[in-house]
């Protein structure tokens, strides 16, 4: 079993690199999704993003985000999601609880779900990176 504290297993430069990669991939996903014309964002779906009661990077709701993106992957074959999931897994503890997502059945509603969650994921990664960098600045002052 592990003899080192968890934080020593994952230096902050790695975390920042992971989140930067996720931010870049989220933009790629959104660009891909936005190519579908005539689809509007829905108010019915909310992607959990940052938790106010945890320190970066544990403040990112990675398990829930993973579950939402896995759902999109099942609805629409976006291969970029495979890579996103691999990076999210670097932030998820092995014993993290599972998140259940209710999937829309209507085709048009599925498209709205995909667009809405993709947009929120992109915004979330921007916020996550900001919270990481501001956290790093606070740690050095």
């Amino acid at each position: 079993s592990h003899t080192l504290p968890v934080r020593l297993l994952r230096p902050s430069d790695d975390v920042q690199k992971i989140v930067e990669e996720l931010q870049s991939l989220s933009k790629m996903l959104l660009k891909d999704v936005e190519e579908e014309k005539g689809v509007l964002v829905s108010q019915n779906y909310t992607l959990p993003c940052l938790s106010p009661d945890a320190q970066p990077p544990n403040n990112i709701h990675s398990p829930a985000i993973r579950a939402y993106l896995k759902t999109i992957r099942q609805l629409d074959n976006k291969s970029v999601i495979d890579e996103i999931i691999e990076h999210l897994d670097k932030l998820i503890f092995q014993d993290a609880p599972e998140t259940n997502i209710s999937v829309p059945t209507d085709t048009h509603e599925c498209k709205r779900f995909i667009l809405t969650i993709s947009q929120q994921f992109s915004e979330c990664m921007d916020l996550a990176l900001k919270s990481l960098t501001s956290g790093a600045q606070q740690a050095t002052t």
């Epitope: 592990h2 790695d14 691999e86 990076h87 897994d89 998820i92 503890f93 092995q94 993290a96 599972e98």
Partner: antibody, heavy 122, light 107 residues
Framework: QVQLVQSGAEVKKPGSSVKVSCKAS????????MQWVRQAPGQGLEWMGA????????RYSQKFKGRVTITADKSTSTAYMELSSLRSEDTAVYYC???????????????WGQGTTVTVSS | AIQMTQSPSSLSASVGDRVTITCRAS??????LAWYQQKPGKVPKLLIY???TSASGVPSRFSGSRSGTDYTLTISSLQPEDVATYYC?????????FGGGTKVEIK
């Protein structure tokens, strides 16, 4: 005590398929990636693919895409690697391996099966 | 795919020598690199994970380090039982490729 036990040696004809199993015991966590690796006689280690058993999510090496299928049966904690259209170059020892925590993504494979020798010969 | 270039492919050193093996990644992979030891006819054994963390039960003469995209496995004082082939493997994104291996022999 974590253990990975693989199925026994196989001798196969060219063009046929082989299915190797890997049973895990002593491990309670569900969020992890298991990998399959092979080693031809006198050669290095070659990554074939991986599976996330909790969901059956898979990743494959481009070299084996279309020929390899990795599956998992959660109820028996067993993973399988099936390789089809076998040729003599597929003669190798096939290993399954998986990591210790704390994260879902691996950064080293702590546990390895004993290896399964597959011989492809006419 | 990320390429892992391992060097040297083989080396011969005397007992007690300091031995270094290097793996260079074709792009930044952070600390997502492992080192394995494989003795002839045996299963690979994890030595180092996360670039520089020793696996349980690994002798202290084995250590890992990183400089940018270069990763080094060092055996501080080579022992007869260290005769083996050593491999690196990255885990940044699939495919999780291996280095070509370094065969270590005793002079």
């Amino acid at each position: 005590q974590v253990q990975l036990v693989q199925s026994g040696a196989e001798v196969k004809k060219p063009g046929s398929s082989v299915k190797v199993s890997c049973k895990a015991s002593g491990y309670t966590r569900t969020r992890y990636w298991m990998q399959w690796v092979r080693q031809a006689p006198g050669q290095g280690l070659e990554w074939m693919g991986a599976i996330y058993p909790a969901e059956g999510d898979t990743r494959y090496s481009q070299k084996f895409k279309g020929r390899v299928t990795i599956t998992a049966d959660k109820s028996t904690s067993t993973a399988y690697m099936e390789l089809s259209s076998l040729r003599s170059e597929d003669t190798a020892v096939y290993y399954c391996a998986f990591p210790e925590g704390p994260y879902a993504a691996p950064y080293g494979m702590h546990y390895w099966g004993q290896g399964t020798t597959v011989t492809v010969s006419s | 795919a990320i390429q892992m270039t391992q060097s040297p492919s083989s080396l011969s050193a005397s007992v007690g020598d300091r031995v270094t093996i290097t793996c260079r990644a074709s792009r930044n992979i952070g600390n997502y690199l492992a080192w394995y030891q494989q003795k002839p006819g045996k299963v690979p054994k994890l030595l180092i994970y996360y670039a520089k963390t020793s696996a349980s039960g690994v002798p202290s003469r084995f250590s890992g380090s990183r400089s940018g995209t270069d990763y080094t496995l060092t055996i501080s004082s080579l022992q007869p039982e260290d005769v083996a082939t050593y491999y690196c493997q990255h885990f940044w994104k699939t495919p999780w490729t291996f280095g070509g291996g370094t065969k270590v022999e005793i002079k």
